[in-house]
């Protein structure tokens, strides 16, 4: 019968969420260990009745209206480990009378986010918390951190300060936190990190500030543990000096104003010529650094949405562990990775939405690359084996370029064309919007693609045998918006084809699928189909799940197969109610309303629907 009382009780967990409670109930089980009172209208927290529940380990008081904490309100809760007071009104003066939260001897996580707390006030609120591991002060109104902000928290490991208005962090503000490993300072108003010295820190989020420079402290023997650094959405002009951070695995520098230098640094050490755009590229580590090869452990680097025009050869040299590199939305005109062993571990390279005209990939560079994103560039005359050289390439997106595919080995095609045959690892290829005029025979021979998108190439001519060799592998084929009047592709031979998009062409006939195939989705929108005869579509009945037909001049009569699907078939015809057909009289009606008796001999109709 406990389901009929407002709070839900299971084992020693009690949930009293969003019940409009004005006070803590006095009638909960005395051995309750987890109590969720979030989303109520509690205004004050008193020692009675809260102190009745001495077994509490988890207490959630978030999203209430708490502005008063009775001194010693949590004193009786000697087992309390997790306390959330997030999204209340603790900044109101009454919350802080006589000692704030008081000592919290066993609390390991404390959430005070969203309380409009401001600097100075926080120090009065936080009491002694010797076991505290995790503290959230996010979404408050803190403007500065001092040496006194975080005292009596020797065990603190994770500190979340995101979404405050921090402008100033006093030297030594984190000195009393020797175990701090995770620090989130995102969404603040910091402008400069001039002396980063938190050696034990492993994760640092500085995203969404106004940081113009990031500099580590000049401690030659320092062993920085930082593995994860997020500096996205700042105002960095240069690649930051990270030579002192040899353990970095993840680095996000997207959405800054970074430009990489165009020539070698003027300074012999290579780390101090900011006028040239150098703020220490990962070229040389300071002497005494344990690693000696800065960024050699980096796995993920995001430099998207910057102002990079050129990648110097030396920039990629030490990134020997890099798996993911995002350079999209920059100003690159050329990209080169020609050196043997260049970026040997790279699996994903995103160069999309730049201004790339040339791309030079060495025969044995990028040996692990699986995904190459090049959409939204200006690639035109590439060396023919640009992609054939990439031994592990599985996914290639070339949408919005001007790439012309060569034919098969027997029909190489014009100069400047790119070979897509013989790339045995390639599975997905997008050639959308490349102004391709002719797809030559054998273009994809010995390239077992499962997905091929050739859409938005108006005037495309698909030569006989252009898709030859894909019959046993292709699962998704898109030819949308090409103005095709005839399809020179023997579709029924593509036994694995699951999704076929032929929308926005001028097709009026399909080949006959007489035997069962795998096709599940067929998009024929905005073509010139008047009839879909059962003789052609019969083989699709067992597999087809979805058929798109809007925008075709369908005939009301002679479409028996289609009518059957609309009424009781397994095929889901999209927008059935809006599917319009025409009688010979040119009268338009909804196809779903047509009855067999409406179609008389000769296709005439003299009955008013």
């Amino acid at each position: 019968h406990q389901d009929k009382v407002p709070c839900k009780m299971v084992d020693k967990k009690v949930s009293c969420q969003v019940l409009g409670l004005l006070q803590v109930p006095s009638v909960l089980p005395p051995d309750t260990e987890t109590l969720d009172l979030s989303g109520n209208q509690l205004r004050s927290i008193l020692a009675s009745p809260l102190g009745f529940y001495t077994a509490l380990r988890h207490l959630d008081l978030s999203t209430n209206e708490i502005s008063f904490l009775q001194p010693g309100a949590f004193q009786a809760l000697t087992h309390l480990e997790h306390l959330s007071l997030a999204h209340n009104r603790l900044a109101m003066a009454t919350a802080l009378s006589a000692g704030g939260l008081g000592p919290l001897p066993r609390v390991t996580s404390l959430d005070l986010s969203g309380n409009s707390l401001y600097s100075g006030l926080l120090e009065r609120l936080l009491g002694e918390a010797p076991s505290l591991h995790t503290l959230s002060l996010a979404e408050n109104s803190l403007t500065r951190l001092t040496r006194h902000t975080f005292r009596d928290m020797p065990a603190l490991e994770q500190l979340d300060l995101h979404s405050n208005v921090l402008m100033d962090i006093e030297d030594g503000a984190f000195e009393g936190l020797p175990r701090l490993t995770h620090l989130n300072l995102s969404r603040n108003s910091l402008t400069c990190i001039s002396d980063f010295s938190l050696q034990q820190l492993r994760v640092l989020d500085l995203s969404c500030n106004s940081i113009e420079a990031f500099q580590t402290a000049s401690q030659p023997q320092a062993e920085f543990q930082l593995t994860w650094l997020d500096l996205r959405e700042n105002k960095l002009l240069h690649f930051p000096d990270l030579a002192a951070l040899p353990r970095l695995i993840y680095l996000n520098l997207s959405n800054n104003l970074i430009r990489l230098p165009t020539g070698p640094p003027q300074d012999s050490k290579g780390i101090h010529a900011p006028s040239e755009g150098w703020s220490a590229l990962p070229l040389s580590a300071p002497s005494g650094n344990a690693s000696g090869r800065p960024l050699s452990q980096l796995l993920n680097l995001d430099l998207s949405y910057n102002e990079i025009e050129l990648i110097p050869d030396s920039f990629l040299e030490h990134l020997t562990s890099l798996c993911f590199l995002n350079l999209s939305r920059n100003c690159l005109r050329t990209f080169e990775a020609r050196r043997l062993g260049s970026l040997p571990c790279l699996m994903l390279l995103d160069l999309s939405h730049n201004a790339l005209e040339t791309l030079e990939l060495g025969a044995r560079a990028l040996g692990s690359l699986r995904t190459l994103l090049l959409q939204g560039n200006a690639l035109r005359d590439l060396p023919p084996y640009t992609f054939a050289n990439l031994a592990s390439l599985q996914r290639l997106n070339l949408q919005g370029n001007r790439v012309s595919p060569c034919g098969g080995p027997d029909e190489p095609g014009p100069s400047g064309c790119v070979a897509f045959s013989g790339i045995t690892s390639l599975r997905s290829l997008s050639l959308v919007d490349n102004e391709i005029e002719l797809l030559r025979a054998g273009a994809f021979l010995h390239t077992p693609l499962t997905e091929l998108d050739l859409s938005s190439n108006p005037g495309l001519e698909v030569a006989t045998g252009a898709l030859g060799g894909l019959e046993a592998s292709l699962e998704v084929l898109a030819l949308q918006g090409n103005g095709l009047m005839v399809l020179q592709v023997d579709l029924p031979c593509f036994i694995c084809l699951k999704r076929l998009n032929l929308a926005e062409n001028r097709l009026s006939h399909l080949p006959a699928w007489t035997q069962a195939v795998s096709l599940e989705v067929l998009d024929l929108r905005n073509n010139s189909f008047s009839l879909l005869p059962g003789s052609a579509m019969g083989g699709l009945e067992t597999s087809l799940r979805r058929l798109y037909l809007q925008g075709n001049p369908l005939s009301c009569c002679g479409n028996g197969w289609l009518a059957a699907q609309l009424h009781q078939g397994r095929v889901d015809v999209d927008a059935t109610q809006d599917l319009i057909c025409r009688f010979s009289s040119q009268e338009e009606v909804s196809l779903s309303h047509v009855r067999p008796e409406d179609c008389e001999k000769g296709g005439l109709k003299n009955i008013n629907l």
Partner: antibody, heavy 116, light 107 residues
Framework: QVQLQQPGPELVKPGASVKLTCKAS????????MHWVKRGPGRGLEWIGR????????HYHEKFKTKVTLTVDKPSSTAYMEFSSLTSEDSAVYYC?????????WGQGTAVTVSS | DIQMTQTTSSLSASLGDRVTISCRAS??????LNWYQQKPDGTVELLIY???TLHSGVPSRFSGSGSGTDYSLTISNLEQEDIATYFC?????????FGSGTKLEII
């Protein structure tokens, strides 16, 4: 099934003390408050107080604070109410009752008579 | 302390009648109201808790309603075994307090 067993009547002299017992069975003893209620002759019911068996923490009605002490023995799942300095006013039937939202199971009550 | 008032100390009704017993709190008790039945032999049972929730095993002819400060217990079809004294109790705020009781008799 849930049972609260209280012993038979007690005859006590004025000024003396008495310790009433309530043995619980059939449920997790520490998951419910144990309440004590007085029914005086010709009177209604009066709430004396309650105790949390898991911690031994007790809450009393102001009226009984100096008169009554509530305790528990967890291993034997037994609750106790000790009365001190008894007077004739304390002659009544005393019930123990288990309960959180409501006192859903009651003992049969122990009649205490204070007489010289 | 919150005072609980049962204005009707005794009530007479016939078998089969619909009987309503009322209870008023001196302040809002947020539905934390229980009803108890004390039989002539002294045994006490919980009938309804949290204003309207029927305790297990209690016949469905008993029902409770109310909010704020005013609450009531209704017996829809009075039976012989319902002869007893009925007490309301608030458990919103310590100390928990009982009403003075309403004694139900058969005419």
């Amino acid at each position: 099934q849930v049972q609260l067993q209280q012993p038979g009547p007690e005859l006590v002299k004025p000024g003396a003390s008495v310790k009433l017992t309530c043995k619980a069975s059939g449920y997790i003893f520490t998951s419910y408050w144990m309440h004590w209620v007085k029914r005086g002759p010709g009177r209604g019911l009066e709430w004396i107080g309650r105790i949390a068996p898991n911690s031994g923490g007790a809450h009393y009605h102001e009226k009984f604070k100096t008169k009554v002490t509530l305790t528990v023995d967890k291993p034997s799942s037994t609750a106790y109410m000790e009365f001190s300095s008894l007077t004739s006013e304390d002659s009544a039937v005393y019930y123990c009752a288990r309960g959180n939202y409501g006192m859903d199971y009651w003992g049969q009550g122990t009649a205490v008579t204070v007489s010289s | 302390d919150i005072q609980m008032t049962q204005t009707t100390s005794s009530l007479s009704a016939s078998l089969g009648d619909r009987v309503t017993i009322s209870c008023r709190a001196s302040q809002d008790i947020s539905n934390y109201l229980n009803w108890y039945q004390q039989k002539p032999d002294g045994t006490v049972e919980l009938l309804i808790y949290y204003t309207s929730t029927l305790h297990s095993g209690v016949p469905s002819r008993f029902s409770g309603s109310g909010s704020g400060t005013d609450y009531s217990l209704t017996i829809s079809n009075l039976e012989q075994e319902d002869i007893a004294t009925y007490f309301c109790q608030q458990v919103n705020t310590l100390p928990f307090t009982f009403g003075s009781g309403t004694k139900l008799e058969i005419i």
